[in-house]
């Protein structure tokens, strides 16, 4: 790499993948290794992710561009930019500080991440239960009482004494 | 670079806002910027992260939760630190770092500023 | 939390020397750990990252190794720019509840 020429700022002319090197009378030196620069003009090379562990590579490191990480199969990401990877756990199930725990009854999670989360309660909107709720699945809403042929019974759940539950992260 | 400001003398129980500008590199960017401190003579305290992506994510160091907190404003490229309840144990040069490696590791810094919490 | 542990916390070493400075981890964080090297009145300057990675600008006579919980600076030949305080620091973003980010206590490399 040539040594750069501007009249202005000598680093200005440092492209993409270089750094502008002060102890070598500011020539443009590439990036070293796990390391880049996404903009011209650096005098520092940024330092590429690594996807270790439960993390997983999506992109790698070029030297004019950072790393993007995912997790690997049984976790999801969380955070920015993927940050962290958290547990993945079955539907019906939540996350705590000692793994994976069925959801209480009264509660649900139709995903493998998050919290479980209180039934609705159909009484609420003046509606009765149609279909009955279960750790995987909310209950289904139909009509309310008073819409219902005489003799047809409903099953409306008391709500759940519970404050929903918190995952740990 | 990163430059910090802000800094100045403040009562025990006061408050005061740091701020870091950015140049030469986008806050869109997907960047980590931290504030890290030193007080007279001592070492170096990692006290909050943000992330200066899209999603802003927070962390505290437990010596900075419930006082102080971390934000961003994108279009003016500038991180703030607004300490609350402030006391004697909080002087210390307050510096900016960045990170792009997800792991605390600051290629970046600032020049710093210094706070001094005395009566 | 994370806690490293820097020694020793000060050395006294002559132009030329090899020098080491050590840093432990309290629990493994593989290899998530950089050294830092600072002057009075001046903010720190990054010379290794991911235990062993030389960052740009830095001259090679810094080296860094180890992983787990054990990690060494060395500096092959000290130089009269050379004495400063070291610092390590170790890492990585788990949750808002249970973030770890420590430094260790620092390392004064001063003139024998």
């Known amino acids: 790499f040539e040594r750069t020429r501007s009249l202005q700022d000598p680093c200005s002319n440092c492209p993409a993948g270089t750094f502008c090197d002060n102890n070598r009378n500011q020539i443009c030196s590439p990036c070293p290794p796990n390391s880049f620069s996404s903009a011209g003009g650096q005098r520092t090379c940024d330092i590429c992710r690594q996807c270790k562990g439960v993390f997983r590579t999506r992109k790698e490191c070029s030297s004019t561009s950072n790393a993007e990480c995912d997790c690997t199969p049984g976790f999801h990401c969380l955070g920015a930019g993927c940050s962290m990877c958290e547990q993945d756990c079955k539907q019906g199930q939540e996350l705590t500080k000692k793994g994976c725990k069925d959801c209480c009854f009264g509660t649900f999670n139709d995903q493998k991440r998050g919290i479980c989360r209180p039934w609705t309660n159909c009484s609420l909107d003046g509606k009765s239960v149609l279909v009955n709720g279960t750790k995987e699945r909310d209950v289904v809403c139909g009509p309310s009482p008073a819409d219902l042929s005489p003799g047809a019974s409903s099953v409306t759940p008391p709500a759940p004494a519970r404050e929903p539950g918190h995952s740990p992260q | 670079s990163l430059v910090e400001s802000g800094g100045g003398l403040v009562q025990p129980g006061g408050s005061l806002r740091l701020s870091c500008a950015a140049s030469?590199?986008?806050?869109?960017?997907?960047?980590?910027i931290c504030w890290v401190r030193q007080a007279p003579g001592k070492g170096l305290e990692w006290i909050a992260c943000?992330?200066?992506?899209?999603?802003?994510?927070?962390y505290y160091a437990s010596s900075a939760k419930g006082r102080f907190t971390i934000s961003r404003d994108n279009s003016k490229n500038t991180l703030y630190l607004q300490m609350n309840s402030l006391r004697a144990e909080d002087t210390a040069v307050y510096y900016c770092?960045?990170?792009?490696?997800?792991?605390?590791?600051?290629?970046?810094w600032g020049q710093g500023t210094l706070v001094t919490v005395s009566s | 939390a994370l806690v490293m542990t820097q020694s020793p916390s000060t050395l006294s070493a002559s132009v030329g020397d090899r020098v080491t400075i050590n840093c432990q981890a309290s629990?493994?964080?593989?290899?998530?750990l950089a050294w830092y090297q600072q002057k009075p009145g001046k903010a720190p300057k990054l010379l290794i990252f991911?235990?062993?990675d030389l960052a740009s600008g830095v001259p090679s006579r810094f080296s860094g190794s180890g992983s787990g919980t054990e990690f060494t600076l060395t500096i092959s030949s000290l130089q009269p720019d050379d004495f400063a305080t070291y610092y390590c620091?170790?890492?990585?973003?788990?949750?808002?509840?249970?973030?770890?980010?420590?430094f260790g206590g620092g390392t004064k490399v001063e003139i024998k």
């Open positions: 943000i992330y200066v992506g899209s999603s802003g994510d927070t």
């Open positions: 620091q170790g890492g990585y973003y788990t949750s808002s509840a249970d973030t770890r980010g420590a």
């Open positions: 991911y235990a062993s």
């Open positions: 770092a960045r990170d792009s490696s997800s792991y605390y590791m600051f290629n970046l």
């Open positions: 030469g590199f986008s806050f869109s960017s997907n960047y980590w």
């Open positions: 629990e493994d964080i593989d290899t998530y």
